[in-house]
């Protein structure tokens, strides 16, 4: 807490300008009017204040706006934003995407801080849903943003927003998240033709059900092994050898290198060995010839 001291004669600030960097902390406290600071916040970022001086300016704004800063001040905070605590930010009502961008810019190049997480949370809650422009902005600054959301939060993403998602934005998503995103992507890209559709849907396929994978296998998509390895095991298991061969196209040869890893390992265990042999890859571990395969899940469904 800075002591209340009278402003020395002739030092009362008439505007926010560079002369203030020569003020001591107590002079800034005594000589800068908080209302003047609030109306001229856009100038602060161009003036090389020390961190200690910025603390004083924040203190002045906190006194002026105990219930939280108005957006007119927030959008011009610049590096003063780095001085804010999540508690401060929870008092804000940020509705403008431009304000959000300005503050994210300040934190650019750093990990998502608790301040930024709180800011994004306030912004998205205020908007009610994660619209395309917001998602575009957030993933541009934080590619992993989407995968940091819970499946419940992801359910508020409208299908139209999926167009803003880049493959790298999904790198850290787990199957539960892809389960929510895949149907939205399918809806978003439904009017695209085969090859274009596959390019767009590919990064979401970790959430695809068996029937969609079967449908893709009929379209000469040549799925790469990296994508195949990210598919849900339960979605891959029912695929026949012929379907997997069609799905992977020339990439089918890569199965040999992955035969000990899921989902390939589990899929091999479900196939007849003579079907696997038709691939000519030397895949081992299939069901020996002459064995009867009982699909217990089907039996349960019938009883």
């Amino acid at each position: 807490e800075v002591e209340k001291t009278a402003c020395p004669s002739g030092k009362k600030a008439r505007e926010i300008d560079e002369s203030l960097i020569f003020y001591k902390k107590w002079e800034l406290e005594a000589c800068v009017d908080a209302a003047l600071l609030a109306t001229q916040m856009d100038r602060v970022n161009a003036i090389p204040f020390t961190y200690e001086q910025l603390d004083v300016l924040k203190h002045k704004l906190d006194e002026l706006y105990p219930q939280g800063y108005p957006e007119s001040v927030i959008q011009h905070l610049g590096y003063l934003f780095l001085k804010m605590s999540p508690e401060d930010i929870r008092k804000w009502n940020v509705t403008s995407l431009e304000t959000l961008k300005a503050l994210l810019e300040v934190n650019k190049g750093h990990e998502m801080s608790p301040q930024v997480a709180t800011l994004i949370d306030r912004f998205v809650k205020g908007r009610g849903q994660l619209d395309k422009d917001t998602l575009d902005t957030l993933t541009a600054f934080y590619p992993g943003y989407l995968c940091s959301l819970s499946p419940e939060e992801l359910s508020s993403v409208p299908p139209s927003s999926i167009w803003a998602v880049r493959p790298q934005d999904l790198d850290t998503c787990d199957p539960r998240q892809l389960d929510v995103l895949y149907p939205k992507a399918r809806l978003a890209f439904q009017n695209m033709n085969g090859s274009e559709y596959f390019v767009k849907i590919q990064s979401f396929l970790g959430g695809a059900p068996t029937e969609d994978l079967k449908a893709l296998s009929q379209q000469n998509v040549s799925m790469d092994l990296a994508t195949f390895m990210k598919l849900r095991t339960d979605a891959v298991l029912p695929l026949t050898v012929a379907e997997v061969q069609k799905l992977l196209g020339p990439h089918v040869e890569g199965l040999k290198a992955e035969e000990r890893h899921r989902p390939v390992r589990d899929w091999i265990l479900r196939q007849r060995q003579d079907d696997l042999d038709t691939l000519g890859l030397g895949l081992q571990g299939g069901i020996p010839n002459g064995y009867l395969v009982l699909d217990l899940s089907m039996q349960e469904a019938l009883s």
Epitope: E15, D17, E18, S19, I21, F22, N45, A46, I47, P48, T50, G78, Y79, E105, V106, K108
Partner: antibody
Framework: QVQLVQSGAEVKKPGSSVKVSCKAS????????ISWVRQAPGQGLEWMGN????????NYAQKFQGRVTITADESTSTAYMELSSLRSEDTAVYYC????????WGQGTLVTVSS | DIALTQPASVSGSPGQSITISCTGT?????????VSWYQQHPGKAPKLMIY???SRPSGVSNRFSGSKSGNTASLTISGLQAEDEADYYC?????????FGGGTKLTVL
Amino acid sequence: QVQLVQSGAEVKKPGSSVKVSCKASGGTFSSHAISWVRQAPGQGLEWMGNIMPIFGVANYAQKFQGRVTITADESTSTAYMELSSLRSEDTAVYYCAREMRLAYWGQGTLVTVSS
Amino acid sequence: DIALTQPASVSGSPGQSITISCTGTSSDIGHFNYVSWYQQHPGKAPKLMIYSVISRPSGVSNRFSGSKSGNTASLTISGLQAEDEADYYCASFTFPSLVFGGGTKLTVL
């Protein structure tokens, strides 16, 4: 809008002094720093020092300490840079620039030091 | 006053993006958020392109952007144009002095 107009080119003898002026118009003169930056032929920019006219406080780069004097006259909105004990390596274009971020620049003054 | 370190030259083709780095120390670039970038065409005075690491003065194209990570600041120019060919200087303000980088010559191929 802000404009900075500098004095004309100078040719000086080694050991002498030169005083370059920079007249500002537009905006508030007193409350914005005026910096002096020089550039030797084919070389980069070199910050020499600055002054905050309202306080008359000047700060100098270590390299020029004791050889340069920066002053400001608020009544005419003019800043001055005087460099003494000139040597041939001081041959350069000398610029004044306003604001700490050097937002506005003068046209430059060529100072040639030659015997 | 130790100069900041910039590459002597960079080049790029029209339409491409290029990035110029500016490396300082934890007591200048690393500690303060006051890095500026200047563009200088031959025979002309420098022009402020970026200040306070990321801010653009009005009138400067949004093809120019700044960023900072640790002790290194960067200037990125996207959609390179012929008129971008110039010398670029970074500068860092540490109260009450300022220090420049050695400059980078950008060539548009």
